[in-house]
Every structure is written in structure tokens, then in C-alpha cells.
């Protein structure tokens, strides 16, 4: 959804609810920058390619990030 804006944050709302790592197509972590002064986490789901904004401060989401990074380190040689 292309939006013209000066502040280029992405998420209007965020969710505390964890997502099943198996149902994840992609997980993007966008660090704070001059364009957006906060960290944003965007989960793309396999089903319908739906994108969700997740709460970086939520314990459940932090656990999800740990699980995903653990999975990635297993895969990398």
C-alpha cells in the first residue's frame, strides 16, 4: 500500500499475539532509523501472504524471535 509520508513507519497497530513459526513465510525486523524512530517487526504469513505487525516489547514476540533465530542458525552451515 503506497503511502506518501514524512515519517515512514509502517505499523498503525501492533499485536502481542505470537505467530506459529511454521506458518511464517517471512519475518522482517526493521530497526529504528531517521525515517521511523521505532523498531518494527512485520510477519508475512504463508496463508494469503497476510502481513502482521508485531509488538517488539511483547514477551511472546521476543520468544518468537529467539525461536526463529535459533532455527536460522541451525540451517546455516
Amino acid at each position: 500500500v503506497p503511502l506518501s509520508r514524512t515519517v515512514r513507519c509502517t505499523c498503525i497497530s501492533i499485536s502481542n499475539q505470537p505467530v506459529n513459526p511454521r506458518s511464517l513465510e517471512k519475518l522482517e525486523i526493521i530497526p529504528a532509523s531517521q525515517f521511523c524512530p521505532r523498531v518494527e517487526i512485520i510477519a508475512t504469513m504463508k496463508k494469503k501472504g497476510e502481513k502482521r505487525c508485531l509488538n517488539p516489547e511483547s514477551k511472546a514476540i521476543k520468544n518468537l524471535l529467539k525461536a526463529v533465530s535459533k532455527e536460522m542458525s541451525k540451517r546455516s552451515p
Partner: antibody, heavy 123, light 107 residues
Framework: QVQLVESGGGVVQPGRSLRLSCAAS????????MHWVRQAPGKGLEWVAV????????YYADSVKGRFTISRDNSKNTLYLQINSLRAEDTAVYYC????????????????WGQGTLVTVSS | DIQMTQSPSSLSASVGDRVTITCRAS??????LAWYQQKPEKAPKSLIY???SLQSGVPSRFSGSGSGTDFTLTISSLQPEDFATYYC?????????FGGGTKVEIK
């Protein structure tokens, strides 16, 4: 359960200002993008403005840009709409609404609505 | 802005009837469409989001379908409490826009 209660409406003269409030409870307000939507008497629904969950982003309908300001106080679970330079065409019931919590980029559909507050602009 | 065109603007029906309301977007909006019900002097109530997902607590006689530009709200068996005005809304891009409404009246 989710509750949104608007207040601050009334009869005002053209050119004057008004501040509407929306007190929220029953959900995690600080995670939720919030909108104002209005409805002129006997007419359809018109989106007015949105603010993101922590107040960084605001968007407005062209018809109100420069005159309306949306803001929020997460410590008080309250949404505001400051309306300046009121015109006759601003006469409407003003609703605050929550948006579905996970929709990427907003705009979002509106999960819950308040009961509305009537603003009448008349000399 | 994306224009949303609803039809019909009003209809008369009887309890038990199957009712279909259509909504057309001026450009493709994927499945980013919601439907609302509004009764006189009341706030709108969310029925359906993402074109076909039923909002929690909404009776299963309500269903939504469509994607792209053409969408439908169906009430499989109209109940007395369903007489109201129905609005569609796109949320693919800003500004969110609503259809003009469809008033469902008692025949």
C-alpha cells in the same frame, strides 16, 4: 468488553473550535490504531483521521486537513480530535473506532465503534 | 481515492428471504473489504472483514464473498433484527472509503 465513549460534542458557531474525546477500555489501547469517522445527518459514513498506536503517524481526510488534529494519551487510554475553524459541513455525529490489530500499514477495518457525539455547527 | 459503489441503495424484503447486497470498488482492493450494519440512531457494527471473515459474535446467516473489485454481502435468511442500513468499506489504501449504504426495509 470493549468500550469507547465519545464526549465533547455540542452546538458551536462557525469558525469556533471544539475538542472531542474518546475514552477507551476493555482492550490494549496502546497497541491499537484509532480512527475518527463522521456521519452527517441522514448521510453515509466518512472517514476523518487515524493515529497509530504510539502517536507517531497521523493521516487525515482531505476535507479536514489543516483544521483537524488527532492525538492520543496512552496513559489515559484516551483519543482526541481537535477541530478548528468549524464549518456548517462539519455538522455530524463523530465516532471513534478501533482498527483490527494486525493489519499491516493500516488503514484497517473498524472492529469497535463508540456511540458517537453530535457536533452541530450553527450561527 | 478509491470509490465504492453499493447496490441497490434500498431494498424491501420479508423475514426469511435471502438478501444480497453488492459493492464495487473503482480499482482492485484485493480482499481488503469490510461490511457494517447500522440501525437508526446507533453506531455501526462490524459484520465482516477481509471480504469473507465473520466478526466474532456475528450470526452465521451473514456471509461475504469476492475479491479484486466485486464483493457481495449475503443474508441467508433475513431476521427481524436485520432490518438496517449496510455499508461496505475498503481498506486497501488511504483514505479508507465507504459505499453509500443499502437500506434493508420490511416489505
Amino acid at each position: 468488553q470493549v468500550q469507547l465513549v465519545e464526549s465533547g460534542g455540542g452546538v458551536v458557531q462557525p469558525g469556533r473550535s471544539l475538542r472531542l474525546s474518546c475514552a477507551a477500555s476493555g482492550f490494549t489501547f496502546s497497541n491499537s490504531g484509532m480512527h475518527w469517522v463522521r456521519q452527517a445527518p441522514g448521510k453515509g459514513l466518512e472517514w476523518v483521521a487515524v493515529i497509530d498506536y504510539d502517536g507517531i503517524i497521523q493521516y487525515y481526510a482531505d476535507s479536514v486537513k489543516g483544521r483537524f488534529t488527532i492525538s492520543r494519551d496512552n496513559s489515559k487510554n484516551t483519543l482526541y480530535l481537535q477541530i478548528n475553524s468549524l464549518r456548517a459541513e462539519d455538522t455530524a455525529v463523530y465516532y471513534c473506532a478501533t482498527e483490527r490489530g494486525t493489519h499491516y500499514y493500516g488503514s484497517g477495518s473498524f472492529d469497535y465503534w463508540g456511540q458517537g457525539t453530535l457536533v452541530t455547527v450553527s450561527s | 481515492d478509491i470509490q465504492m459503489t453499493q447496490s441497490p441503495s434500498s431494498l424491501s424484503a420479508s423475514v426469511g428471504d435471502r438478501v444480497t447486497i453488492t459493492c464495487r470498488a473503482s480499482q482492485g482492493i484485493s480482499s481488503w473489504l469490510a461490511w457494517y450494519q447500522q440501525k437508526p440512531e446507533k453506531a455501526p457494527k462490524s459484520l465482516i472483514y477481509a471480504a469473507s471473515s465473520l466478526q466474532s459474535g456475528v450470526p452465521s446467516r451473514f456471509s461475504g464473498s469476492g475479491s479484486g473489485t466485486d464483493f457481495t454481502l449475503t443474508i441467508s435468511s433475513l431476521q427481524p433484527e436485520d432490518f438496517a442500513t449496510y455499508y461496505c468499506q475498503q481498506y486497501n489504501s488511504y483514505p479508507p472509503t465507504f459505499g453509500g449504504g443499502t437500506k434493508v426495509e420490511i416489505k
